[in-house]
Interface confidence: low
Amino acid sequence: DSEEDEEHTIITDTELPPLKLMHSFCAFKADDGPCKAIMKRFFFNIFTRQCEEFIYGGCEGNQNRFESLEECKKMCTRDNANRIIKTTLQQEKPDFCFLEEDPGICRGYITRYFYNNQTKQCERFKYGGCLGNMNNFETLEECKNICEDGPNGFQVDNYGTQLNAVNNSLTPQSTKVPSLFEFHGPSWCLTPADRGLCRANENRFYYNSVIGKCRPFKYSGCGGNENNFTSKQECLRACKKGFIQRISKGGLIKTKRKRKKQRVKIAYEEIFVKNM
C-alpha cells in the first residue's frame, strides 16, 4: 500500500556544503554492532556535522564510537571547517578499501567493483550475492569516488554508504540534514524489512519506523537484517522506544510515537553498513 511505498522517504532540510573529514572513520554510520547490550556512546554524524549520542550493543561496530562527547569532538570536528587536513592517502582512505576482494559464499555471480590496493585502481570482480565485505561497489564510479586517489588525496564529500536491502550492495547517499525527529532506540529498528536471499516464506514482523508499528513481512529463511522478529510482541519489545524531538537549544524531549500520517525517516540512521 502507499504507506509502505513511502517507507524510504527522508524528510530533510537544506543541504550543507561538501564535508571534509579529519579521519575517514568519522564518516562511518553509528554502528551498534550485533550484540544486545545497551551502552551510551558518541559518534560523529556526517549529516548534522556534530557529535551525537547513540546506543552501542557492546561488541564489534566500528571506529566511529567514542566514550565521551569530548573525545568524539577531538577526533572528528575542528575549529576551521574549511581547512583541509593534509595527511597521507593511507590514513584518509576508509579501511575497507584495503580489504581483499571477497566474493562471499553465495553463487549469484554479480559483476561488482573493488579497490585493488596493489594496482591502486578499482577493478571488476564477480560477487556471489551475499556476505563478502565492504570493498564491494555496484559501479566503477562509486568505487573510484570512495577508494581511488583524488587530486588532493582522499577527501570525503557527499560520503555515506547505504546498504541496499535487496542485494546487500553499497550505494551512495547524499549528505543531507535530518529532520527534527530522531529515533532513540536500536538502529536496526530503522532498517527496512529485508527478505534475505533464500526461498522460504516465513511469517515475520519488522518495525516500520515511519508509522511506528510492527508490520508482518515474508522472510526468505536466511540473510536479511536484525529488524526481523518471530512475533509482533517481540518486535514491539525491541523497538517500542519513542521518537525524540530536538528542541532549539539542543535539549531533547520525548515525544509519543502516535503521529499517524507524519512521514519521518532519519537519514543518518538509515545508513546501515554491515560489519566488516
Epitope: 550485533p34 544486545k36 547490550a37 545497551i38 557492546g58 529463511g221 540473510g223 526481523n228
Partner: antibody, heavy 117, light 111 residues
C-alpha cells in the same frame, strides 16, 4: 520447539585442543539471534565463552580470545567450539545456548569435559 | 568486566516461607530506564533455566511465586511461597556489557 544438543569428547589431554559441536533443531542458526558457548566449572562458576551471530560475526570472551574459535556449518545447522592448549582448569560442563535480546532463553543439556593426562 | 556477587552462597528455607537472594553488581547495569539483570534457576543435572529477565519480568511459564526487583547495582530474587521443586541453584546474569557475566550462584535447600 527449539532444541540444542552438545556433543564432543568426554576426555581431553592437557595441551591438546577441545572441539565441541552444538546441533540446533527447530530454528535456523542463520535466521536470527546469536548462538553461544557457556561453561560451568566444578564448584558452579559460570563463564560465557563466545558466540556466533546469525550473520556470521563472532565474539569471544577476552580472557579466552587467544585460544578460542567458534565456527558454524549452516547446512547442518550446527556451530562449533574449539579451545586450544587446554589445561586441567578447562575441565567443565560446556553448554551451548541461544541469546534472545538480553537473556539466554534456550540451553543445551550440557556436556562434561574432563582435561586429564 | 562487571563482577556479580551473590549472597548468601546457600540458604535453607521452610516450605511455604520466603527465600530472598541478593545480587550486587560492581557497576550499574541500568540504561535508559531498563535494568539488564536476569535470573536463572539450575536444578541438579539440568542446564540453567530463565526465570526473570531485565530485573523484574517473569519469563513465560514461570510460576508467579518468583519475582525480581532492584536497579542500578542491587538486585533481589524472591521466591514465596517456597515449594519442594524450588530446590536448585540460582544465578544472576548481567547483559549490559560484554563479556556477559554470571553471579557465583546461591544454593536453595528446604529446611
Amino acid at each position: 520447539d527449539v532444541q540444542l544438543q552438545e556433543s564432543g569428547p568426554d576426555l581431553v589431554k592437557p595441551s591438546q585442543s577441545l572441539s565441541l559441536t552444538c546441533t540446533v533443531t527447530g530454528y535456523s542458526i542463520t535466521s536470527g539471534y546469536s548462538w553461544h558457548w557457556i561453561r560451568q566449572f566444578p564448584g558452579n562458576k559460570v563463564e560465557w565463552m563466545a558466540y556466533i551471530h546469525y550473520s556470521g560475526s563472532t565474539r569471544y570472551n577476552p580472557s579466552l580470545k587467544s585460544r578460542i574459535s567458534i565456527t558454524r556449518d549452516t547446512s547442518k545447522n550446527q556451530f562449533f567450539l574449539q579451545l586450544n592448549s587446554v589445561t586441567t582448569e578447562d575441565s567443565a560442563t560446556y553448554y551451548c545456548g541461544r541469546r534472545a535480546w538480553t537473556w539466554f532463553d534456550y540451553w543445551g543439556q550440557g556436556t562434561l569435559v574432563t582435561v586429564s593426562a | 568486566d562487571i563482577v556479580l556477587t551473590q549472597s548468601p552462597g546457600s540458604l535453607a528455607v521452610s516450605l511455604g516461607q520466603r527465600a530472598t537472594i541478593s545480587c550486587k553488581a560492581s557497576q550499574s547495569v541500568d540504561y535508559d530506564g531498563n535494568s539488564f539483570m536476569n535470573w536463572y534457576q539450575q536444578r541438579p543435572g539440568q542446564p540453567p533455566k530463565l526465570l526473570i529477565y531485565e530485573a523484574s519480568n517473569l519469563e513465560s511459564g514461570i510460576p508467579v511465586r518468583f519475582s525480581g526487583s532492584g536497579s542500578g547495582t542491587d538486585f533481589t530474587l524472591n521466591i514465596h511461597p517456597v515449594e519442594e521443586e524450588d530446590v536448585a541453584t540460582y544465578y544472576c546474569q548481567q547483559s549490559k556489557e560484554d563479556p556477559w557475566t554470571f553471579g557465583g550462584g546461591t544454593k536453595l535447600e528446604i529446611k
